[in-house]
Interface confidence: low
């Protein structure tokens, strides 16, 4: 059933403080797969109970999962039928609350009546202010029955409805002739579509045996649990003041759920919250009673105490609803009340049990809805429990239903029913929709109708160029958002398909039908301008820019940032691949360098106009320069460099870097690492004979330091052309000795 609760605050002394709140606990209400579903609706239904027109009621939304109705000005505004509608698609559900005037001539002994098909329903209207006239009964606003006022039994007018059928459901009212309709007793009759304990088409399936006043839904066999209870069979009590299918909601205010009426999806109807009773839900349960409307009796045994919210609290050594079961009797432990698997998977189901004597593997069995018994394939025995693992054969849809784990020992037996939902992985029924296209990207709506079961956990878009045999590219996307396929080829047709997945192993559905989408490529025309920049480190620069505001979509795939190092005559290009980007961090720059910077928009392979340039100076960094660099030719292919270590070092040097360049040459300089930082001399080998070279060097600690002075030296003549310089290091003294 849909997790939808309509709360009525029954502070009737002041209609202006009265409010109705509808709360949806549905997973992803207003998000995810429901984000495009209809919102919660909360309204007064004037079709049957008509009240005088008044000022319009105020509706306030608190996010997507809660809506509140206020603005009642007089008591008559409250009388009648209110409904909340929530859930999407086939799960769209209406929850109804019927409000009676506390000053009416006739008051219902009980407002909501849930009965089974074929039962006798008895509606009882209690005389509050006697009138010696006929009593008219109506059903859904139409005349139904008349009673002579003499027929009151024990101050009550009874309407017996024998052999009720689902069409008998609806709003019933008892009114004295000639009295205001607002003085009627209003009732809600809910007739389940099946006899007691049955559900499903043809009513052939057996209900799970809902506990704590839960009502078996005649369509899906699930228990609609009273407020304050949870679990497949409503076997578990929530903490005080909590409600919702997973106890996830909290009653507002300091007095918890006092004074609140809770209405849940049919066939439950309405009741007070757990621990409360009375026409205004303001009376705590009498001792020994608990639950919604205090309808349940504790009858705790073996020293158990009655808690009005949860029932019996058992002393150590006892368990069970009435603390009637000794802990010696085997007990199934912590069995999930509901499990969900995907079609054709082969899940493992664990069932843990404890007891004395201790359960062994063979004493725990799993029974499927069709009666098939599975024996465990392995068991984990721990000091306090045995956990049996069952390997379930490939699941089919018929495996949906109530499974049972049963443990039997000489100490007795225990069983726990749990619901298994076999879900069909979703398959798209349509292709995705193209929303916008650019030269290198397509914006796609992955939202498609699908067969099978939700919720959708993952949406995958598969795409590749049309008529291509290359592998499909895949992108995993948020189902509620449009998707941008990026880095595409301009003016190219792409085949695009959706694949949906639902949670759990084997939840991936088949691919949906393909559609053809073609990329575009107009020329970028906008000229950006640089807004600013700031240095984030000696080699890092944060740059920001803007574009002029123009109507229509932005024509561009991204931005190109260019940095020109005039000293070295080098250009650095940085590609920012998002047209929405307005900032970039440039790293690996040279400290102490003066750069000229500009930015331009690009689209496909086309560049737009560049921004006006900016000039940026990066601060120097690293250790000071090595001192007294000296070059000395040793042969026609070798030059020895000597130097002194830098002064005032901030840490140990990790290496030296030597720059070698032919004097007057146009080629790039060569950098050679001296990896032994204790060296103060190195020999550069493989040089060309009779050639003039320029040398400079710098030290590195964590970053590269300042360059030393440049020295010149020529190799000796008559040598052959060398392959290129290499270096050989040794201590300065050793080099000099040689």
């Amino acid at each position: 059933a849909v997790d939808l609760t309509l709360l009525a605050n029954l502070r009737l002394t002041d209609p202006q403080r009265f409010f109705l709140t509808c709360v949806s606990g549905e997973a992803g209400a207003g998000r995810g797969s429901d984000a495009w579903g209809p919102p919660l609706l909360l309204e007064k239904d004037d079709r049957i109970v008509r009240t005088p027109p008044g000022p319009p009621l105020r509706l306030a939304r608190n996010g997507s999962h809660q809506v509140t109705l206020r603005g009642f000005s007089k008591p008559s505004d409250l009388v009648g039928v209110f409904s909340c509608v929530g859930g999407a698609g086939a799960r769209r559900t209406r929850v109804i609350y019927v409000h009676n005037s506390p000053g009416a001539h006739l008051l219902p002994d009980k407002v909501t009546h849930t009965v089974n098909k074929g039962d006798t329903a008895v509606l009882s209207a209690r005389v509050h202010k006697e009138k010696q006239t006929d009593v008219i009964w109506k059903s859904n606003g139409s005349y139904f029955y008349t009673l002579d006022w003499h027929e009151a039994q024990d101050g009550r007018f009874l309407l017996q409805l024998p052999n009720v059928q689902p069409p008998s459901s609806g709003i019933y009212s008892a009114t004295y002739l000639e009295a205001s309709p607002l003085g009627s007793a209003f009732f809600r009759l809910i007739v389940r579509g099946c006899g007691a304990g049955r559900w499903g088409p043809g009513c052939t399936k057996e209900c799970p045996g809902c506990l704590h006043g839960g009502v078996c839904h005649d369509h899906d066999g699930e228990c609609v649990c009273p407020p304050g209870f949870t679990g497949t069979r409503c076997e578990q009590a929530c903490r005080e003041g909590r409600f919702g299918q997973s106890c996830q909601e909290q009653c507002p205010g300091i007095s918890g759920c006092r004074g609140l009426t809770f209405c849940l999806p049919d066939p439950y109807g309405c009741s007070c919250g757990s621990g409360w009773r009375g026409s205004q839900c303001q009376e705590a349960c009498a001792p020994g009673h608990f639950g919604a409307d205090c309808r349940l009796q504790c009858q705790c045994q073996n020293g158990g105490t009655c808690d009005r919210f949860s029932g019996c609290v058992c002393p150590s050594g006892w368990h069970g609803v009435h603390c009637e079961k000794s802990d010696r009797i085997p007990q199934i432990l912590n069995m999930a009340s509901e499990l969900e698997f995907n079609l054709e998977t082969m899940p493992r189901i664990n069932c843990a049990a404890a007891g004395n004597p201790f359960p062994v593997r063979g004493s725990i069995e799993l029974r499927k809805p069709d009666g098939t018994v599975l024996l465990s394939t392995k068991a984990i025995v721990e000091p306090e429990k045995t956990t049996a693992e069952f390997e379930v054969p490939r699941l089919v849809l018929a495996d949906s239903g109530f499974w049972e784990c049963r443990v039997s020992t000489s100490g007795g037996q225990d069983s726990r029913r749990f619901k298994v939902n076999v879900k069909v992985p979703p398959v798209p029924l349509a292709a995705p929709r193209l929303l916008t296209k650019q030269s290198r990207q397509l914006v796609v709506s992955p939202l498609v109708s699908f067969s099978g079961d939700g919720p959708i956990s993952t949406v995958r878009l598969h795409y590749r160029p049309q008529d291509s045999t290359m592998d499909w590219s895949t992108i995993v996307v948020d189902p509620s958002e449009n998707v941008t396929l990026m880095n595409l080829r301009p003016k190219t047709g792409y085949s695009v398909r959706v694949q949906l997945s639902r949670p759990g192993e084997g939840g991936e559905g088949a691919w949906g039908p393909p559609t053809l989408m073609t990329t575009d490529c107009p020329e970028p025309l906008l000229q950006p301008w640089l807004e600013g920049w700031h240095v984030e480190g000696t080699d890092r620069l944060r740059v920001s820019w803007s574009l002029p505001l123009v109507p229509g979509p932005l024509v561009g795939d991204g931005f190109l940032l260019r940095l020109w190092d005039g000293t070295r005559g080098q250009e650095r290009r940085e590609n920012v691949s998002s047209p929405q980007a307005r900032t970039a961090l440039l790293t690996g720059l040279t400290p102490g360098t003066h750069y000229q910077l500009d930015v331009q928009l690009y689209h496909c392979t086309l560049l737009g106009p560049a921004s006006p340039p900016a000039h940026v100076l990066l601060p120097p960094s690293g250790p000071p320069a090595p001192r007294h660099l000296h070059a000395q030719a040793l042969s026609d292919s070798e030059i020895q460099l000597t130097w002194k270590h830098p002064e005032a070092l901030p840490g140990p040097i990790s290496k030296y870097v030597v720059e070698v360049q032919v004097a007057g040459g146009a080629g790039d300089p060569l950098w050679i690492d001296v990896d032994r930082p204790e060296e103060t001399s190195t020999i550069i080998r493989g040089l060309n004979a009779s050639t003039r070279y320029l040398f400079r060097m710098r030290a590195s600690i964590q970053g590269l330091g300042d360059w030393s002075n440049t020295v010149e030296e020529s190799t000796l003549g008559n040598g052959l052309q060398a392959e290129g310089p290499v270096q050989e290091s040794r201590a300065a003294e050793e080099g000099l000795d040689q």
Partner: antibody, heavy 125, light 109 residues
Framework: EVQLLESGGGLVQPGGSLRLSCAAS????????MIWVRQAPGKGLEWVSR????????EYADSVKGRFTISRDNSKNTLYLQMNSLRAEDTAVYYC??????????????????WGQGTMVTVSS | DIQMTQSPGTLSLSPGERATLSCRAS???????LAWYQQKPGQAPRLLIY???SRATGIPDRFSGSGSGTDFTLTITRLEPEDFAVYFC??????????FGGGTKVEIK
């Protein structure tokens, strides 16, 4: 005074027929669901049949289905049980009773609050 | 079908003693629609308890009912001479719609 009075019992041969009547007084008969219950000599109570106030809905125990017919005449405040194809095991005291719905915190609780004094039916050859 | 089993078959007690009569259903009784009746020789049954635990009009408070689901109990706290009789439990609303237990005879010891 609220009361029910059965009549029509007696000795009948196996295969024979009898019609029992139950006259109601002191309450609005047409508003109440009515039942027949029987008790074989020295045995417990066995529900036989029930009929809804309108007379439209009827139900029977498996042991009498197809042989017994329950009916009512609301204008005469009378309940009937037509018994055909009688068997020796139908020998019992037959009671009619009124179904009243009591209301308490857990809902409406049906109970048989008014009983007739019973009429003896003996099936014997 | 729902079967109602009463125990013990006979209870021999003295006036002033406490009587505890048990009634067990073969499956859960819907909505605790269970009643208890007292029958004396040559008389029609008389309603004592409805809804498993509510006393009918005019029934002394020494009679009390309890239980839910499948296990129900009738307790007579102090037996009076007029309480010696046969007691029947009865469920309503299951299949068949009405079922009686076999009865417990409370006799003078």
């Amino acid at each position: 005074e609220v009361q029910l009075l059965e009549s029509g019992g007696g000795l009948v041969q196996p295969g024979g027929s009898l019609r029992l009547s139950c006259a109601a007084s002191g309450f609005t008969f047409s508003s109440y669901l009515m039942i027949w219950v029987r008790q074989a000599p020295g045995k417990g109570l066995e529900w036989v049949s029930r009929i809804y106030p309108s007379g439209g809905g009827t139900e029977y125990a498996d042991s009498v289905k197809g042989r017994f017919t329950i009916s009512r005449d609301n204008s005469k405040n009378t309940l009937y049980l037509q018994m055909n194809s009688l068997r020796a095991e139908d020998t019992a005291v037959y009671y009619c009773a009124r179904v009243t719905y009591y209301y308490d915190s857990s809902g409406y609780q049906p109970a048989f609050d008014i009983w007739g004094q019973g009429t003896m039916v003996t099936v014997s050859s | 079908d729902i079967q109602m089993t009463q125990s013990p078959g006979t209870l021999s007690l003295s006036p002033g003693e406490r009587a505890t009569l048990s009634c067990r259903a073969s499956q859960s009784v819907s909505g605790n629609l269970l009643a208890w009746y007292q029958q004396k020789p040559g008389q029609a049954p008389r309603l004592l308890i409805y809804g498993a635990s509510s006393r009918a009009t005019g029934i002394p408070d020494r009679f009390s009912g309890s239980g839910s689901g499948t296990d129900f109990t009738l307790t007579i706290t102090r037996l009076e001479p007029e309480d010696f009789a046969v007691y029947f439990c009865q469920q309503y609303g299951g299949s068949p719609p009405v079922t009686f237990g076999g009865g417990t005879k409370v006799e003078i010891k």
